[in-house]
Interface confidence: low
């Protein structure tokens, strides 16, 4: 029997991703969407997406239970995407559970989104 793992998102104010209009601002940082609720299984792959846009382009960091996420070759990685950043965990284990937070900053402002993997 598969053990279910799901991600529940902390709701935060969002706005639609409208780069064209946002780029007219001198500086901005927007959380475009909170982390989505997902359900997956042990041994499978989970992806957490930090969907932000900004000018200048934001720097995004990942935290698990308030500590920086440490990448593991071929298993746990994060990288920049079109929408911000993606954290991918392969071969899920029960030890992967916890609170995941992405923090984005453009040097002036900070936005964050938190999800729970359990």
């Amino acid at each position: 029997q598969e053990t279910e793992l799901s991600v529940s998102a902390e709701l935060v104010p969002t706005s639609s991703w409208n780069i064209s209009s946002e780029l007219n601002k001198d500086s901005y940082l927007t959380l475009d969407e909170p982390m989505n609720n997902i359900t997956t299984s042990l041994g499978q792959t989970a992806e957490l997406h930090c969907k932000v846009s900004g000018n200048p382009p934001p720097t995004i960091r990942w935290f698990k239970n308030d500590a920086p996420v440490v990448q593991e070759p071929r298993r746990l990685s994060f990288r920049s995407t079109i929408y911000g950043s993606r954290l991918r965990i392969r071969n899920l284990d029960t030890t992967d559970t916890g609170y995941f937070q992405c923090v984005a900053t453009n040097g002036k402002e900070v936005v964050s989104s938190t999800g729970v993997l359990f």
């Epitope: 780069i19 064209s20 989505n36 997406h49 200048p56 920049s80 079109i82």
Partner: antibody, heavy 114, light 107 residues
Framework: QVQLVQSGAEVKKPGASVKVSCKAS????????MHWVRQAPGQGLEWMGW????????KFNHKFDGRVTMTRDTSTSTVYMELSSLRSEDTAVYYC???????WGQGTMVTVSS | DIQMTQSPSSLSASVGDRVTITCQAS??????LIWFQQKPGKAPKSLIY???SLANGVPSRFSGSGSGTDFTLTISSLQPEDFATYYC?????????FGPGTKVDIK
Amino acid sequence: QVQLVQSGAEVKKPGASVKVSCKASGYTLTTNYMHWVRQAPGQGLEWMGWIYPGNGNTKFNHKFDGRVTMTRDTSTSTVYMELSSLRSEDTAVYYCAISDFDYWGQGTMVTVSS
Amino acid sequence: DIQMTQSPSSLSASVGDRVTITCQASQDIGNNLIWFQQKPGKAPKSLIYFATSLANGVPSRFSGSGSGTDFTLTISSLQPEDFATYYCLQYREYPLTFGPGTKVDIK
């Protein structure tokens, strides 16, 4: 592994509509944007828009406003792109691609001819 | 819309050559640029993200540089499997726009 499997080739008359499907497996459909890109024979790539299957939100290239519709069926992990009022210049291979263009479907050839 | 131009439109090279392809945006796009490789009859494959970051599984002979309006894709030592068409894509502003492509063929 991640796979995007598209529906088969279509031949349509000018003025008709075509609906292309893209079935996803190996990843969570609802947490990834799905883009549609087309390529006319011997030509370059053209972005048509995206759908976010988690909530059905869409964003289109204004060139296609009013002619393109993107929908999803999360129960079958399938996304659809429908293009209406077809004309000969819509003859192209239509591709679906997820999120940051990591994975692509094999393409669907749509031929518009009278 | 942001216009993307590429040069050259085509080039002939030999295995082992160093190949450089440039992409220019009509306005500042920061580092919001992807490079793709496409072979005949196949879907494009991503090579470089955020102008300089190598995609998973892509050989290290591929590299990207640039920011703002001018970008470069370099293949340090061309291999037989690298003969293809290369496209850049900007995702700084909607609509996302591709460059017209650069075809790399055998000399």
